[in-house]
């Protein structure tokens, strides 16, 4: 029986050109995590394997960094990075747990946008 739950950062936003950490945490289970896969819609971004360590898909090598922990850091964000991200925990003996994060990449931060139009 699968008793674990995945906690994620949920819906997050970041500024274009900046970076963001995607983080998931598996709790409420004693199952051994053998591998965590990170996917963006139908694209494999990275894999963290308990034995082999990290593998970053070559097409994302310039913009994806492993960690912290089992998380993933996305750098040099573009508006095209907006969308769903999934952390897929492969565990033994439980099986597979999946967490979802929605990232919105904004053209500019609300704070900057507001400051630009302040009346002196």
């Amino acid at each position: 029986m699968m008793t674990g739950t995945i906690e994620t950062t949920g819906n997050i936003s970041a500024e274009k050109g900046g970076s963001i950490i995607l983080q998931c945490h598996l709790s409420s289970t004693t199952a051994q995590v053998t591998q965590v896969n990170w996917e963006q819609q139908d694209q494999l971004l990275a894999i963290c394997n308990a034995d082999l360590g990290w593998h970053i898909s070559p097409s994302f090598k310039d913009r994806v960094a492993p960690g912290p922990g089992l998380g993933l850091t996305l750098q040099s964000l573009t508006v095209n990075d907006t969308g769903e991200y999934f952390c897929i925990y492969h565990t033994y003996p439980d099986g597979t747990y999946t967490g979802r994060i929605f990232l919105e990449v904004l053209e500019s931060s609300v704070a900057e946008h507001g400051a630009r139009f302040q009346i002196p």
Epitope: T34, D42, N49, D51, L52
Partner: antibody
């Protein structure tokens, strides 16, 4: 250099048994999932079985479930496939394969031929 | 089980031709799709993994694309050593399954 060397193939009668071995070298065997894939003469590739790096998790094709057993000895860098109740349709070249990240086969052995015939 | 359908089953081409092989999965497999090349009497060789990642040491004339259910292997300029049989394989779930193969022959 990664090397996978299968052995144990041969001619066996229907209902008989064989044990295939795959000796691995050139990499940390205990860190990789390993699989068996077979190819009947003139046919395509068919996945047979897989085992996790520590041997704790195994999986089988429906066509061999209950008859074949995959195992590994990490201290000997060796993968095994125990094949019982063999049938004519099990005739094939059997390949041992290394599977990083449980996602693709990056190295294959040269294969060993199993012929099941009376 | 996830069925993998490859097309065409065979094709004839000349050196220098651009060759495209397609593979369709019976359900979405994200990008867990790999391509192998096999020559007669030899073990298969990994060309492309995770749909579009080129395996180390494989010439850049080989490329892969696609996600979900539809995938493509392209050889941009066919070389004499590329005449072989090509297989796709899904690693989204067990049982792992292969396409039926595409034999690339000399025209």
């Amino acid at each position: 250099e990664v090397q996978l060397l299968e052995s144990g193939g041969g001619l066996v009668q229907p209902g008989g048994s064989l044990r295939l071995s795959c000796a691995a070298s050139g990499f940390t065997f205990s860190s990789y999932a390993m699989h068996w894939v077979r190819q009947a003469p003139g046919k395509g590739l068919e996945w047979v079985s897989g085992i996790s790096s520590n041997g704790g998790s195994t999986s089988y094709a429906d066509s061999v479930k209950g008859r074949f057993t995959i195992s590994r000895d990490n201290s000997k860098n060796t993968l095994y496939l125990q094949m019982n109740s063999l049938r004519a349709e099990d005739t094939a070249v059997y390949y041992c394969a290394r599977v990083p990240y449980s996602a693709w086969i990056d190295y294959w052995g040269q294969g060993t031929l199993v012929t099941v015939s009376s | 089980d996830i069925q993998m359908t490859q097309s065409p089953s065979s094709l004839s081409a000349s050196v220098g031709d651009r060759v495209t092989i397609t593979c369709r999965a019976s359900q979405s497999i994200s990008s867990y799709l790999n391509w192998y090349q096999q020559k007669p009497g030899k073990a298969p060789k990994l060309l492309i993994y995770a749909a579009s990642s080129l395996q180390s040491g494989v010439p850049s004339r080989f490329s892969g694309s696609g996600s979900g259910t539809d995938f493509t292997l392209t050889i941009s300029s066919l070389q004499p050593e590329d005449f072989a049989t090509y297989y796709c394989q899904q690693s989204y779930s067990t049982p792992l399954t292969f396409g039926g193969g595409t034999k690339v022959e000399i025209k």
